[in-house]
Interface confidence: low
């Protein structure tokens, strides 16, 4: 199709070589074309937009994304040619940064419903470049944490070195939805709740004498509780003796609850004590069985193919540890009578 009629938007992605970050393009269809696809919803807070920004379509899977090769070849379907780019409804997600993402991206409705819709498309010229060392050394991260129950803020990485007074007007999105009241380079959250978690996008306009473009950054925000002050506790086994049948297989489970830590290095292992000897058992891998904001429950089993007389003289010890300290629970096997 002829892309000469598409509205054009220029975007800049300056990525940090020190960290992993993602990027998104929205299929921001133009205002004037009040067709099935190309109208912006003017909605009150009760009528939250049904779709990602500015889409009027009934079904966002009706949007098609293309890349325009620089050598003048025909448009390429994004889904077929670029595995590191994912189309999610009318948003294009770039999973890895790199200058090779630079180029022209076109989106348009799959179904053209009237003659006026032919030019209902957007061409986004994306320039991608690494952040220079001369740039701000302490720019905000693309992964930010908010402490639940406290006051916090989300900073726009590309503007975090500027004072609020110098900062241009910023457009913010959360999970693809426009946050219309936020215009500064920092969103201040009076009281952090778990629903403040999500993917935030901040845009601002930069101009030179020739043209203007949108500078965009993506921030993954996580809501967290404060680091635990407690060592892990063992939920199972509770008893220090376990009745068993000789010659039968046996699985003993160790379940431990670890409080939240930003830097989380949980240890859970089994070892066996036999008179003066002590050795660790290479048992199946530990697995997380429940994860919440506050804590994580991790389980690790020890498997005996069959219980022997020797096992009755041994102690099976579950050892768990976090950065605060460790806890152990030992189990002595006892032959079941009768």
């Amino acid at each position: 199709f002829n892309i000469s009629g598409c509205s054009t938007k220029k975007l800049l992605w300056t990525y940090s070589t020190r960290s992993e970050e993602e990027f998104v393009l929205f299929c921001d269809l133009p205002e004037p074309q009040k067709s099935h696809f190309c109208h912006r919803n003017r909605l009150s807070p009760k009528q939250v937009p049904e779709h990602l920004p500015f889409m009027g379509s009934n079904d966002l899977s009706d949007v098609q994304w293309y890349q325009q090769p620089s050598n003048g070849d025909p448009l390429e379907d994004i889904r077929k040619s670029y595995p590191h780019i994912i189309q999610d409804k009318c948003t294009l997600h770039f999973l890895t940064p790199g200058v090779n993402n630079s180029g022209s991206y076109i989106c348009r409705p799959k179904m053209i419903k009237s003659p006026y819709d032919v030019a209902c498309c957007v061409k986004m010229i994306l320039e991608v470049k690494p952040q220079t060392n001369a740039s701000c050394e302490y720019s905000a991260s693309h992964k930010q944490d908010l402490l639940l129950g406290s006051t916090g803020s989300i900073s726009c990485p590309s503007l975090s070195c500027q004072s609020d007074a110098q900062s241009p007007a910023v457009t913010w999105y959360k999970n693809g939805k426009l946050l219309s009241v936020e215009r500064s380079n920092r969103i201040v959250v009076d009281e952090v709740y778990d629903y403040h978690q999500g993917t935030y996008v901040c845009d601002y306009t930069q101009s030179d004498t020739v043209s203007s473009w949108t500078v965009r950054a993506v921030v993954q925000v996580r809501t967290i509780v404060g680091d635990t002050k407690l060592k892990p506790d063992i939920l199972d086994p509770v008893e220090d003796t376990l009745e068993v049948e000789l010659g039968k297989p046996l699985t003993i489970s160790c379940k431990a609850r670890f409080g939240f830590e930003r830097v989380f290095n949980p240890v859970i292992k089994w070892y066996i004590k036999d008179s003066d000897l002590e050795w660790e058992v290479s048992v199946p891998e530990a697995k997380s069985i429940k994860s919440t904001l506050k804590d994580e429950i991790i389980e690790r089993n020890i498997i005996l193919e069959k219980v022997t007389q020797r096992d009755l003289r041994r102690k099976f010890v579950c050892f768990v540890q976090n950065s605060i300290g460790n806890t152990t629970q030992s189990v002595q096997l006892k032959e079941k009578r009768g």
Epitope: P45, H51, N58, Y193, D194, Y195, H196, L293
Partner: antibody
């Protein structure tokens, strides 16, 4: 809009699945919640499902209900109904981000479930 | 878990009068409160969110306010159509994902 279906008279212990059909918005972008109301009583929240986080349940509802979804419907399965589960069951869009909080809107008209032997 | 205590259970007021319904949260929930109106045989309808913001299409006769953990819904210039049961709802999700509603207030218009 949202609309519930599947409510009927059911014997205690017989599993029952209610369906909420949505139109005009995508379940990819919104969560859908279930709330019930016993005859002459108040509103009781059961749980919600969304594409990102899966299903979440009120603490009292865990194990008693299962919420699942397709592209345009959300099901609520009452795993083993008792007479206390006799109620009108509503589905509602939400929670979603609006002014930094979660609300339920719109609601379906409700479907009546009667559990009796 | 948060508990929402709604008072009174029932109130009867003449047309043109004013009704005040209160909702007390057992702990701080910030401004995370919504009010719903439910008429007999109908589903609830959102009136107010974020304690004081009027939902789309709702008459300005409905007013929500907050003082600490106490929330108030005021209906002024009462009309016959306002006869309904009103529920408050804490809209903040804690880890348990319980979403507490108040017990409801029946408004009778004389």
């Amino acid at each position: 809009s949202v609309e519930e279906s599947g409510g009927r008279l059911v014997a205690p212990g017989t599993p029952l699945t209610l369906t909420c059909t949505v139109s005009g918005f995508s379940l990819n972008n919104y969560a859908l919640s279930w709330v019930r109301q016993a005859p002459g009583k108040g509103l009781e929240y059961i749980g919600f499902i969304n594409i990102i986080h899966g299903a979440y349940y009120a603490s009292w509802a865990k194990g008693r209900f299962t919420i699942s979804k397709t592209s345009t419907t959300v099901d609520l399965k009452i795993t083993s109904p008792t007479t206390e589960d006799t109620a009108t069951y509503f589905c509602a869009r939400g929670p979603y981000y609006v002014g930094s909080e979660y609300v339920f809107d719109p609601w379906g008209p409700g479907t009546l479930v009667t559990v009796s032997s | 878990d948060v508990v929402m205590t709604q008072t009174p259970a029932s109130v009867s007021t003449a047309v043109g009068g004013t009704v005040t319904i209160k909702c007390q949260a057992s702990q701080s929930i910030g401004g995370s409160l919504a009010w719903y109106q439910q008429k007999p045989g109908q589903p609830p309808n959102l009136l107010i969110y974020s304690a004081s913001n009027l939902a789309s299409g709702v008459s300005s006769r409905f007013k929500g306010s907050r003082s600490g953990t106490e929330f108030t819904l005021t209906i002024s210039d009462l009309e016959c159509a306002d006869a309904a049961t009103y529920y408050c709802q804490c809209t903040y999700y804690d880890d348990s994902y319980d979403v507490p509603f108040g017990g409801g207030t029946e408004v009778v218009v004389k």
